[in-house]
């Protein structure tokens, strides 16, 4: 009832409680002398629902009868309305309108560990709406019982608080809830299970590994479990990996020899356990162990590529490159890189360890033969030595790949392609396709990349630090034996027109024709290959079209003779250059008077 | 769902008299009070009567007491309401509705009204 009621009272019939789709008859009455002052007869009695009128009455009572509840609660109030004052409050009455329980489903009982205390789940079915009291039964061998009752509003889950023993790891237990509420009662199908079905065991802890003799190949990994524990499950996978191997054991005792390590790893181990080989429960995983393997010595051999220029008559300058080996191939941290080089025929050798680059520049004379040998070592050892013999990579002209090409494919991508050498085309052991950021002058600190190609393919796609609107120098090297032919030519993988101009710095007079000189685009202007240089020319105040002149570009060209003008006419001169994409915007522009003699 | 279909309207000399229908369906009419509601052109809508679940008690608004009568039969799931003495302030749309959507404290809701019924008091 809402508040003291003390004007009247509120009745409900049958109850305060219903199941849905139900019909209440509630009845508001006043007590003797409650009524409006004098006039017993303009008592107007109202009945709200929440704060809606929905009938009234005229005289000491009112009833109403109310169907179409909603599933939940529901307020009424009655109030009195006099004539010429505020309706008064008399009395209110809720209705809890809901449904009897379902049956619980899917009852099923656990025991965490063997110390554990037993502890049971159910599906309550759809809400009752209804204050609904479930009670938990479970019962034993020589007729022990125990009870558990739960009040929550929302109750699937009682802990009975005590704990199975494995004294008899066969007897039968059976558990049962019953959910009872004030329009009806259900009971779960019982359940019966022995310890050996509801025990789930603890995950196993202290997990530990260890490597003898620091070797991956003999690793064990050990751990502790409850004491019935039976059979195990181990899984672990390197600490980027999403994919598990799994491995089952049984009587493990607490360790087991892992075989299958990769070296040099970072791997995650998880442990679940279980106690009997057909029935309960595996345990949850163990919390992770994380451990790296130790290391192992490398296996492989370096991709080593190498470039020579000319200093003088008798020096020439090597230049060794080599890539990082692969994770699984360095098997350990790389250390040093151990680089040999050998006179072949006066057998003099210098060795070399290299840290933190991978590339060495030395200068050897350029009489004898000469070999380098590059191997990659880690705490453990080293890899295979890469040998090279060094020759002149491009002295044999009839090895020389033909009609390269490149271009652009997709983003940052380009495909180089060749035809075999005229030479016997089954004499090329391998190719070679090297690619470096064009800069004018020929910058031997820009970095080196190439990639091997077998001899029976005509096309490579490099991709590997391309960057938009950059001009790439590419050769094609084809290698046979100690003898290499190579062709180049220059791409770019997306190109634009160039952002500006060449800056011309000066024009000299020169027999009657003029030699113009300017400066290179900076690279970041050229947003690609240059093909072309155009250098323009009109008479100064003159509204006729310019002349131009278009000059093949040329990496080392800056200068460019014209012998088109005519004497002592004042001319504007400028220049533009051109990429596939397009011409730049004009360089600065230059004044000239030619003062040599008219014809 | 609940339909209320109202009937009987029409044009009247001042003075004369009409009886207006509503038939209810889609709810138990006889758990209902219900109510019937104006609205003048171009004004707010008014209340004007209610009667009670069981036909036992009515209400009406001052403007109206005395000249029209609200009644009820729950066989027939029907409220009526008898205007007499009309008067050309009378002249409105006229609709039924159940009383707790339209009571003399709160006509704000429109959820249950029927279609209404033009009665016009001209001479």
């Known amino acids: 009832k809402i508040d003291a009621c003390k004007r009247g009272d509120v009745t409900v019939k049958p109850s305060h409680v219903i199941l849905l789709g139900s019909t209440v008859n509630i009845t508001c009455s006043l007590k003797p002398r409650q009524g409006c002052f004098h006039y017993s007869r303009r008592n107007k009695l109202i009945l709200y629902k929440f704060d809606r009128r929905i009938n009234f009455h005229h005289g000491h009572s009112l009833n109403s009868q109310v169907t179409g509840l909603p599933l939940g609660t529901t307020l009424f109030v009655c109030k009195l309305a006099c004539i010429n004052s505020d309706e008064i409050q008399i009395c209110g009455a809720e209705i809890f309108v809901g449904v009897a329980p379902e049956q619980p489903q899917n009852l099923s009982c656990i025991q965490k560990g063997e110390q554990g205390t037993v502890a049971c789940t159910w599906e309550r079915g759809r809400d009752t709406h209804l204050y609904t009291e479930y009670t938990l039964q479970l019962s034993g061998p020589k007729n022990l019982t125990w009870q558990k009752q739960c009040k929550d509003i929302y109750c699937d889950y009682l802990d009975f608080g005590i704990n199975l023993t494995p004294e008899s790891p066969e007897s039968n237990f059976t558990a049962k809830v019953t959910a009872v509420n004030s329009l009806g009662s259900s009971s779960s199908l019982p359940s019966t299970f022995t310890f050996l079905d509801i025990v789930r065991p603890l995950p196993p802890w202290d997990i530990r590994i260890k490597f003898q003799k620091a070797s991956v190949s003999r690793c064990t990994l050990y751990w502790r479990d409850e004491g019935l524990v039976l059979l195990n499950r181990l899984r672990y996978r390197p600490s980027n990996s999403r994919l598990w191997n799994m491995v089952n054991v049984t009587k493990a005792k607490g360790r087991h020899d892992l075989l299958d390590l990769k070296p040099f790893t970072e791997y995650e181990f998880q442990i679940s356990s279980k106690l009997h080989l057909y029935k309960g429960s595996w345990s949850d995983w163990s919390e992770s162990l994380r451990a790296q393997t130790p290391e192992e010595e490398p296996t492989g051999m370096l991709d080593v590529w190498y470039m020579k220029r000319h200093i003088d008559y008798s020096r020439q300058q090597i230049s060794l490159f080599w890539k990082n080996l692969s994770v699984s191939e360095a098997r350990g941290k790389i250390l040093h890189y151990q680089v040999t080089l050998q006179e072949l025929t006066g057998g003099k050798a210098m060795t070399q360890n290299i840290t933190g680059h991978t590339s060495w520049t030395t200068v050897i004379p350029r009489t004898g033969n000469w070999a380098v040998a590059v191997s990659a070592a880690n705490s453990k050892g080293s890899s295979l030595p890469t040998r090279i013999n060094i020759m002149n990579l491009c002295e044999a002209g009839l090895l020389a790949p033909r009609q390269v090409s490149a271009n652009s494919e997709g983003m940052d991508n380009i495909l180089v392609t060749w035809q075999p050498p005229r030479k016997d085309p089954s004499a090329v052991q391998e190719y070679v396709v090297e690619w470096r950021e064009l800069h004018p002058g020929g910058d031997t600190q820009v970095p080196l990349n190439w990639l091997r190609s077998r001899p029976y393919n005509v096309s490579a796609l490099i991709s590997e630090n391309i960057k938009s609107y950059i001009c790439y120098e590419i050769r094609v090297y084809a290698l046979s034996g100690d003898q290499g032919g190579c062709s180049s030519i220059l791409g770019n993988s997306k190109h634009k027109a160039p952002l500006s101009g060449p800056h011309i710095n000066a024009i000299t007079e020169e027999k009657g024709s003029i030699l113009i000189s300017w400066n290179s685009i900076p690279v970041q202007e050229q947003m690609g290959c240059l093909l072309h240089y155009r250098i323009y020319w009109k008479e100064r105040d003159s509204n006729s079209q310019p002349q131009l002149c278009e000059i093949p570009y040329r990496v080392s060209q800056n200068s460019h003779p014209i012998n088109s003008l005519q004497p002592r006419v004042t001319y504007v001169l400028w220049m533009t250059a051109l990429t596939a994409a397009g011409e730049s915007s004009h360089g600065n522009e230059r004044e000239f008077c030619l003062q040599g003699k008219a014809n | 769902q609940v339909q209320l279909q109202e009937s009987g309207g029409g044009l009247v000399q001042p003075g004369g008299s009409l009886r207006l229908t509503c038939v209810a369906s889609?709810?138990?009419?006889?758990?209902?009070?219900m109510s019937w509601v104006r609205q003048p052109p171009g004004k707010g809508r008014e209340w004007i009567s209610a009667?009670?679940?069981?036909?036992?008690?009515?209400d009406y608004a001052d403007s109206v007491m005395g000249r029209f009568t609200i009644s009820r039969d729950n066989a027939k799931n029907t409220v009526y309401l008898q205007m007499n003495s009309l008067k050309s302030e009378d002249t409105a749309a006229y609709y039924c509705a159940k009383y707790e959507d339209c009571s003399d404290y709160d006509c704000s809701s429109r959820a249950s009204w029927g279609q209404g019924t033009q009665v016009t008091v001209s001479s």
């Open positions: 009667i009670n679940s069981g036909g036992d008690s009515t």
């Open positions: 889609g709810f138990p009419f006889s758990t209902h009070a």
